[in-house]
């Protein structure tokens, strides 16, 4: 805390400008009106304040808005956002996607901090669901965002938002998350034709049940081995040799290189040797 001291004569700030960088901490406290600061927050970012000076400015805003900052101030926080604690952010009510983008921009290139995680949580809860625009924004800044959500949180993602998801956004998702996302993707892409549908659904297939894989095997999709290896074990095991051959198409030869890995290893064990031999790959059950 900065002590309350009278502002020296002639030092009272009329506006937020570069002259303030020469003010000592106590002078900033005494000479900068909090209401002026709040209305001219957009100027703060252009001024090279020290971290100590930013602490004073934050303190002034905290005093002015003990219940939490209004969105008009939040949108222009800029680097002052980095001074906020998750406890501060929990008091906010952020509803504008532009505000969210402005604050995410400040943290760009860094890991998701507890502050950013709290901000996103507040924003999404305020909206009630992860709509497409929000998901688009979040995955642009944090490709792993979707996979950082629990299956329960993912259940609030509407199928329409799935169109915003890129394959790399699902890289770190685990099977429980894909179990939630796959039915949404299936719904979202249901009106697409065979080959286009497969291109879109491919990243989500780690959540697909056996019957959907059987259906895909009838559509000449030529699934690559990387996708096959991410399928659920319980979905792969009931597939016949013929179905796997149709599902993989020319990629079926890749099974040999994966024969010691799950789920291929367990699938091989379940097959009759005569059936495996029809593949001509030397797979041993």
């Amino acid at each position: 805390e900065v002590e309350k001291t009278a502002c020296p004569s002639g030092k009272k700030a009329r506006e937020i400008d570069e002259s303030l960088i020469f003010y000592k901490k106590w002078e900033l406290e005494a000479c900068v009106d909090a209401a002026l600061l709040a209305t001219q927050m957009d100027r703060v970012n252009a001024i090279p304040f020290t971290y100590e000076q930013l602490d004073v400015l934050k303190h002034k805003l905290d005093e002015l808005y003990p219940q939490g900052y209004p969105e008009s101030v939040i949108q222009h926080l800029g680097y002052l956002f980095l001074k906020m604690s998750p406890e501060d952010i929990r008091k906010w009510n952020v509803t504008s996607l532009e505000t969210l983008k402005a604050l995410l921009e400040v943290n760009k290139g860094h890991e998701m901090s507890p502050q950013v995680a709290t901000l996103i949580d507040r924003f999404v809860k305020g909206r009630g669901q992860l709509d497409k625009d929000t998901l688009d924004t979040l995955t642009a800044f944090y490709p792993g965002y979707l996979c950082s959500l629990s299956p329960e949180e993912l259940s609030s993602v509407p199928p329409s938002s799935i169109w915003a998801v890129r394959p790399q956004d699902l890289d770190t998702c685990d099977p429980r998350q894909l179990d939630v996302l796959y039915p949404k993707a299936r719904l979202a892409f249901q009106n697409m034709n065979g080959s286009e549908y497969f291109v879109k659904i491919q990243s989500f297939l780690g959540g697909a049940p056996t019957e959907d894989l059987k259906a895909l095997s009838q559509q000449n999709v030529s699934m690559d081995l990387a996708t096959f290896m991410k399928l659920r074990t319980d979905a792969v095991l009931p597939l016949t040799v013929a179905e796997v051959q149709k599902l993989l198409g020319p990629h079926v030869e890749g099974l040999k290189a994966e024969e010691r890995h799950r789920p291929v290893r367990d699938w091989i064990l379940r097959q009759r040797q005569d059936d495996l031999d029809t593949l001509g790959l030397g797979l041993q059950g």
């Epitope: 685990d174 099977p175 429980r176 290896m229 991410k230 074990t233 319980d234 095991l237 010691r260 890995h261 799950r262 290893r265 367990d266 064990l269 379940r270 041993q284 059950g285």
Partner: antibody, heavy 119, light 107 residues
């Protein structure tokens, strides 16, 4: 529910063959969803997987032990067995049999049996 | 063979603490990662399978996360019965390797 019980000698002489049997009760070794494994733990050390067998007779062994290990299954007795040849003091350990469910992991274990290799 | 590296090898914690153990695979193992708990003189017990799925009967304070090469076991609020050694294990590759273990002791 399924239970596993190891049996076999607790003392084996160096250069001889260690033989253990695991009896499965409350379930079947012929389950299509399960592999039957042997795992060991030297005193004060971590876990080392030895190998598994499927009801069909297919086996898979730890590469570091492969030349000395044989695992077999007897579906009529609902048992599977481990043979480890040319043992040395380094093979002294608690030996566990375990069920490896292909959807989960080693979900059921025997209580373990201590085998000491000493002359 | 795939190597599994656990850290830390031991840790001291108090009842109520949040405890995190990490496991790193020498190559990608997708989500094929299991966690076991072992108490002295007892057989290991399966806690988490497929990186994040809780085994039936295991308290919800245990959770797992991760995919590819980096995985985490978290105990949200350590209980007296949780003091034990924890092992990760990969069933992805046929070499079925275990991590070296993490001993959780009372502070």
């Amino acid at each position: 529910q399924v239970q596993l019980q190891e049996s076999g000698p607790g003392l084996v002489k160096p250069s001889e063959t260690l033989s253990l049997t695991c009896t499965v009760s409350g379930g079947s070794v012929s389950s299509r969803d399960d592999l039957w494994s042997w795992i060991r733990q030297p005193p004060g050390k971590g876990l080392e997987w030895i190998g598994y067998i499927y009801y069909s007779g297919s086996t898979n062994y730890n590469p570091s032990l492969k030349s000395r290990v044989t695992i077999s299954v007897d579906t009529s007795k609902n048992q599977f067995s481990l043979k480890l040849s040319s043992v040395t003091a380094a093979d002294t350990a608690v030996y566990y049999c375990a069920r490896d469910n292909v959807f989960t992991g080693f979900d059921i274990w025997g209580q373990g049996t201590m085998v000491t290799v000493s002359s | 063979d795939i190597q599994m590296t656990q850290s830390p090898s031991s840790l001291s914690a108090s009842v109520g603490d949040r405890v995190t153990i990490t496991c790193r695979a020498s190559q990608s193992i997708s989500s094929y990662l299991n966690w076991y708990q072992q108490k002295p003189g007892k057989a290991p017990k399966l806690l988490i399978y497929a990186a994040s799925s809780l085994q039936s009967g295991v308290p919800s304070r245990f959770s797992g996360s991760g995919s590819g090469t980096d995985f985490t076991l978290t105990i949200s609020s350590l209980q007296p019965e949780d003091f034990a050694t924890y092992y990760c294990q990969q069933p992805y590759d046929a070499s079925y390797t275990f991590g070296g273990g993490t001993k959780v002791e009372i502070k």
